[in-house]
């Protein structure tokens, strides 16, 4: 990394987590010194180039879409920046996961699903015939992995005290440590609705 | 399944315009760059235009900068090749292609071509 | 610009045989060569890109190789259906160029 520069930014414009088969877009921040923008994917250590796009574009933030998501696919990702014939910058990295190579988690909840505010509630992802060592719980809509992971089996996933910005579908995924990026399909839905007292009645009469 | 079909060639004179079109589908047409490719006479590929996938940015050969102007509709999935002042040197099977989300300059899938020949 | 010459421009050979096809550059491109194919009735094919990169879905029978300014396209075990014709082009800098094509025949 040159300098004292801030570091570019590396994200997808939609989720990071995606299912075998699908596609993401993934952008690079632009560097205004660099003549080409290189997509680079980390596997052991190593960095092998999957995407370039050439200075052309000005200064528009470097795309790359990724099509046909598969494990090959799913890892590390950063944008590497020649600035020089041996002179290069990175951004950060990005982490894709690929869903559905492996059968699907159940989701449950220790109690009904609309909260009000302040209150608990606790979400189980288990799996009766997959051995998983790993959980993780997702919220739809989210543009980055989810933040919820257990080990434990089942996995107890505690939210709260709630807020306003809780409510959403949730789902979860398991997977094995020695393959990080490669998780299961999606379990079955569970929709959080958290509200305060003035909308208690529009929420129980829907 | 991508499906790319060009229309609007023809017979031109000399000097004359035309517009080709290229109608794309099966995939999200605007994450993708696309470009103009064509086949001459004698068999050979010339890189002919490219749009950038937002529609903001074009780039041209030096052959046919300043007469062609490529354009696109991301609402309407197409493609446009506006040709004028065009030379005998023109004539060839033009072919519409999808640009890789991953690379420039690298083209994945085809169309059929549209055939424009210039001739008094 | 970059000027590709391809060679040779017309090859037959049977089926089960190993062919390979040549592209030179004016100048060093680095890795960043692509093959293409052209079947009558077909859209063109992209091969493989990068040199060396196969694309999805494309037979592992095709194969390329090289750097710099040279770069080879194998294709083994040869099957009726690769008569075609084959075409390189530079990806390393504007203005992408091809080279002049190969017509494949199947004896």
């Known amino acids: 990394q040159e300098g004292d520069f801030p570091m570019p930014f590396i994200s997808a414009k939609s989720s990071p987590v995606i299912p075998l088969d699908g596609s993401v877009k993934i952008q690079c921040q632009a560097i205004r010194e660099a003549y080409l923008t290189q997509l680079m994917i980390i596997k052991n250590s190593t960095y092998r180039e999957i995407g370039r796009r050439l200075k052309f574009w000005n200064e528009t933030d470097p795309e790359f879409v990724i099509d046909h998501m598969d494990a090959n696919k799913a890892g590390r990702y950063q944008c590497q920046y020649r600035i020089g014939h041996y002179r290069f910058r990175y951004s950060d990295t990005l982490e894709l996961v690929v869903t559905g190579l492996y059968g699907k988690p159940f989701l449950s909840a220790d109690r009904g699903l609309v909260l009000m505010p302040g209150e608990n509630i606790s979400l189980t992802c288990s799996s009766a015939h997959i051995p998983f060592d790993r959980f993780s719980l997702a919220k739809e809509g989210e543009l980055s992995l989810p933040q919820h992971q257990s080990g434990e089996h089942p996995a107890n996933f505690s939210l709260g005290p709630v807020d306003l910005n809780v409510s959403g579908i949730y789902r979860c995924y398991g997977w094995y440590n020695r393959s990080p990026y490669l998780w299961s399909f999606p379990s079955n839905a569970l929709e959080l609705v958290v509200t305060d007292s003035i909308h208690q009645d529009y929420t129980t009469q829907n | 399944e991508v499906q790319l079909v060009e229309s609007g060639g023809g017979l031109v004179k000399p000097g004359g315009s035309l517009k080709l079109s290229c109608a794309a589908s099966g995939f999200t047409f605007s994450n993708y760059g696309m470009s103009w490719v064509r086949q001459t006479p004698d068999k050979r590929l010339e890189w002919v235009a490219t749009?950038?996938?937002?529609?903001?940015?074009?780039y041209y050969p030096d052959n046919v900068k300043g007469r062609f102007t490529i354009s696109r509709d991301n609402a309407k999935n197409n493609l446009y090749l506006q040709m004028s002042s065009l030379r005998s040197e023109d004539t060839a099977m033009y072919y519409c292609?999808?640009?890789?989300?991953?690379?420039?300059?690298?083209?994945?899938?085809w169309g059929q071509g549209t055939t424009l020949t210039v001739s008094s | 610009d970059v000027q590709i010459t391809q060679s040779p421009s017309y090859l037959a050979a049977s089926p089960g045989e190993t062919i390979t096809i040549n592209c030179r550059a004016s100048k060093t491109i680095s890795k960043y060569l692509a093959w293409y194919q052209e079947k009558p009735g077909k859209t063109n094919m992209l091969l493989i890109y990068s040199g060396s990169t196969l694309q999805s879905g494309v037979p592992s029978r095709f194969s390329g190789s090289g750097s710099g300014t040279d770069f080879t396209l194998t294709i083994s075990s040869l099957e009726p259906e690769d008569l075609a014709m084959y075409y390189c082009q530079q990806h390393d800098e504007y203005p992408w160029t091809f080279g002049g094509g190969t017509k494949l025949e199947i004896k």
């Open positions: 292609a999808r640009e890789t989300g991953l690379y420039d300059g690298l083209f994945d899938f």
């Open positions: 749009m950038h996938s937002g529609g903001t940015y074009t």
